[in-house]
Amino acid sequence: GSTVPPMVNVTCSEVSEGNITVTCRASSFYPRNITLTWRQDGVSLSHNTQQWGDVLPDGNGTYQTWVATRIRQGEEQRFTCYMEHSGNHGTHPVPSGNSHHHHHHHH
């Protein structure tokens, strides 16, 4: 099939001791090969500080996956989710302030 770019959605949820879990979800993409990683100041976080979900079919002939990490509250601006898929790429910020969701569809 033809390439379908991912929808990327960044969310954050508060956890204890001033840390936040940030999750980057990529969905509705094809083919299944994708790079999804958290960056701090543009530098990829080490593998042992990130948790990845499997790349799974989402039932529409496309795929979905996610990556999560924990960051210190107040440092959200330093972090972005980096995505590469079928020659396209993008960086996606952690939502700031009261906005806890960020959606972006790649074209």
């Epitope: 701090q40 100041d41 543009g42 530098v43 990829s44 500080t49 330093r78 972005t80 790429h89 960086t91």
Partner: antibody
Amino acid sequence: EVQLVQSGAEVKKPGASVKVSCKASGYAFTSNNIYWVRQAPGQGLEWIGYIDPYIGRIIYNQQFKDRVTITADTSTSTAYLELSSLRSEDTAVYYCSRSGERSNFDYWGQGTLVTVSS
Amino acid sequence: EIVLTQSPATLSLSPGERATLSCSASSSISSNYLHWYQQKPGQSPRLLIYRTSNLASGVPARFSGSGSGTDYTLTISSLEPEDFAVYYCQQGGSLPLTFGQGTKVEIK
């Protein structure tokens, strides 16, 4: 081959502004941050700030944020550093650098000497 | 701000000798955020070691890095003539990003 090519040396008077450019090639410009660092004569390295060209996010070293503006033009793969209200202490070589996969500064421009003198 | 203090300021050695450069941080840093750069006169800095102990592309195996917490070390096992330069450590864990003041390795 990744290359960062900076604009030429500048001589400025105190109180003036200077704008230094950094043209990137050999990679997808919007996939990496561009950092700016300066080095006064005979001194060490000092981080000024960076820009994520994809989303336009800029993070400044608070020490510089009142006088520095970092921008990027994705159509020409060029980043810019503008420093205003120049003083003699701003005399330095200004470097642009690209963020790497595993380190903050993996490729560097050749540097631009800015001399502030009356 | 995390202050990085490098010692010694100058190291005078002969080719073939071992060089040990230290970098001490004012606060603890994750080893993932400590990097080393080499700068020769009139040149831009060059990434040497990333994440404490990993050699950057094209860097000879005589260079090595180690450390954790607040104390980090760059070692050159046997100095070659092209190794005489200034070496900087840098931390990327906290803003502002900071560099050490440098250690100059000069020919004795």
